[in-house]
Amino acid sequence: IWELKKDVYVVELDWYPDAPGEMVVLTCDTPEEDGITWTLDQSSEVLGSGKTLTIQVKEFGDAGQYTCHKGGEVLSHSLLLLHKKEDGIWSTDILKDQKEPKNKTFLRCEAKNYSGRFTCWWLTTISTDLTFSVKSSRGSSDPQGVTCGAATLSAERVRGDNKEYEYSVECQEDSACPAAEESLPIEVMVDAVHKLKYENYTSSFFIRDIIKPDPPKNLQLKPLKNSRQVEVSWEYPDTWSTPHSYFSLTFCVQVQGKSKRAKKDRVFTDKTSATVICRKNASISVRAQDRYYSSSWSEWASVPCSGSGSSRGGSGSGGSGGGGSKLRAVPGGSSPAWTQCQQLSQKLCTLAWSAHPLVGHMDLREEGDEETTNDVPHIQCGDGCDPQGLRDNSQFCLQRIHQGLIFYEKLLGSDIFTGEPSLLPDSPVGQLHASLLGLSQLLQPEGHHWETQQIPSLSPSQPWQRLLLRFKILRSLQAFVAVAARVFAHGAATLSP
């Protein structure tokens, strides 16, 4: 038994036929010693007398609000809730399995940007006697603060004969660092109480993995002279992180008729405009995704093809960001070839995802380690890799990136990747390895030496351990190169001489 909140207790029960249940001793919160009686819920039947009451809790009939009285006066209450465990698994009767992105997904969370603000939601078919409370932190062994509001009913839907209720909650990390590479996941815990049943649900994620931008805004069409083509332009959504030269998006533009199976024109672009072929009765739609990390695409923003009269000059804003006059090269050190680094780091992002596209859908944190791999270098908050830090002195950040590149380059050339089980022949790990080396050499020309971090002895003994470690390293590398790519894109846009 444990205390959920003041005067509310949770009894954990193994739930099987003829289970002995749990012996629970309730103590009346009073200085009185004599003449105390106990009742349950609205019943006037006296269950026992004395300052303590011992009960055997086996089923829901034994749970409820126990009250101690003296001479018709209520002294205190103790509410007992049951938490069922069947075959070693805690019950999940209150919430509905959303089955996306995998089975046993009860909580789903999304973030519109990297500010540390996120929303979680869950579904239930229960309409009454239901309460939720939400707690969150970053990390669990030394938790950092995340503040969550109250869960509220956000939608009601009819599903066949049933009604489905969606609840949601908004949370904000207390000291968010949008530009850093996360190393500890956010933990979200939801306590659910339906009548006398208690259940708890948890989710663990990095903000980068739950990013889903809002749709692009201000779609505009401009028909091109003497052509069936239309120039479509748009802007970054207002809710996306700034500056856009650092937090860049990529876009998918699609022209399609009303039917999902209709023929379509489709083009991908990093710009905020594109030229497409518009058809009668078709719509132009644009959606956005983080340019350097394969999180979710936004929902589509759409305009009908027929409305292509609202022409306007320009092609939207927000694409290159940075604006204004170019900043001088970094003080206190030679400036890297920003544009070359940008191109190579973007290639690294592509390679890191093609090296393990499915890694994104595997929950590698189930292995009991709090971070992906404890020993890999992360680009942290104090490393100066944020836009302001780069402007002040980019050398700190570049040194950190260089250390990480050397580290990962050594890891990818180590026994972890060369040993059994052999990599598939078509694995891009070889290309990834070469590109890491290429970028690190661009960052550290001859005669300029930064100290590099020691490679820990990560060599696992079993092939399955090696396979798991590969996944974790590649997953971590995806996050690392995404931050590096943002740094170089921003540098190319604002720091290039």
Epitope: R228, Q229, T250, R261, A262, K263, K264, D265, R266, V267, F268, T269, D270, T275, I277, R279, K280, T350, S354
Partner: antibody, heavy 118, light 107 residues
Framework: QVQLVQSGAEVKKPGASVKVSCKAS????????LHWVRQAPGQGLEWMGW????????EYAPKFQGRVTMTTDTSTSTAYMELRSLRSDDTAVYYC???????????WGQGTMVTVSS | EIVMTQSPATLSVSPGERATLSCRAS??????LHWYQQKPGQAPRLLIY???QSISGIPARFSGSGSGTEFTLTISSLQSEDFAVYYC?????????FGGGTKVEIK
Amino acid sequence: QVQLVQSGAEVKKPGASVKVSCKASGYTFTDYYLHWVRQAPGQGLEWMGWIDPENGDTEYAPKFQGRVTMTTDTSTSTAYMELRSLRSDDTAVYYCNANKELRYFDVWGQGTMVTVSS
Amino acid sequence: EIVMTQSPATLSVSPGERATLSCRASQSISINLHWYQQKPGQAPRLLIYFASQSISGIPARFSGSGSGTEFTLTISSLQSEDFAVYYCQQSNSFPLTFGGGTKVEIK
């Protein structure tokens, strides 16, 4: 399955015109875009243009603008590509291809060899 | 128009070896790039679309990567039926253009 069958080989004199046909089957004709791509002997591929059989919309590569006409006959599920003012460097295999996506080529015809020679 | 450049023009590889084909665009084309295989006397066949998306029915040994201006088609372990000419094609803007092709021949 989706299939495209093209007309037979042609030999033409310089200055003449040629009309190649492409009969589609295995799908609803108006549901796919149709493109024409050519390949000169021993050379690479060259895109000529596309037609939308649903409405007759066309887009031609600038190189062929004014010399090529693409049409369709929905009653027979057939597409046509006419190239006028033929020159010897128009000697090539002409392919039609179909796709639900406008910008790449999924299903190809077997090709029609057009020889331009005096 | 966007010019696509493929290298090498000819690649000599032994069966079972890995082949890496390159395609470069004259300007950034995001991931609007597609790969085709053509055997002598046959029409081309689509292998990969949008830089890395695989086609059902195409063996898993064919994979694509890249974005922006540089793209790669990798054939992990060449089979006898893979000796052919490979073309890349950009779909970023009209006119659609192809690379000059890379001939993969038996070493």
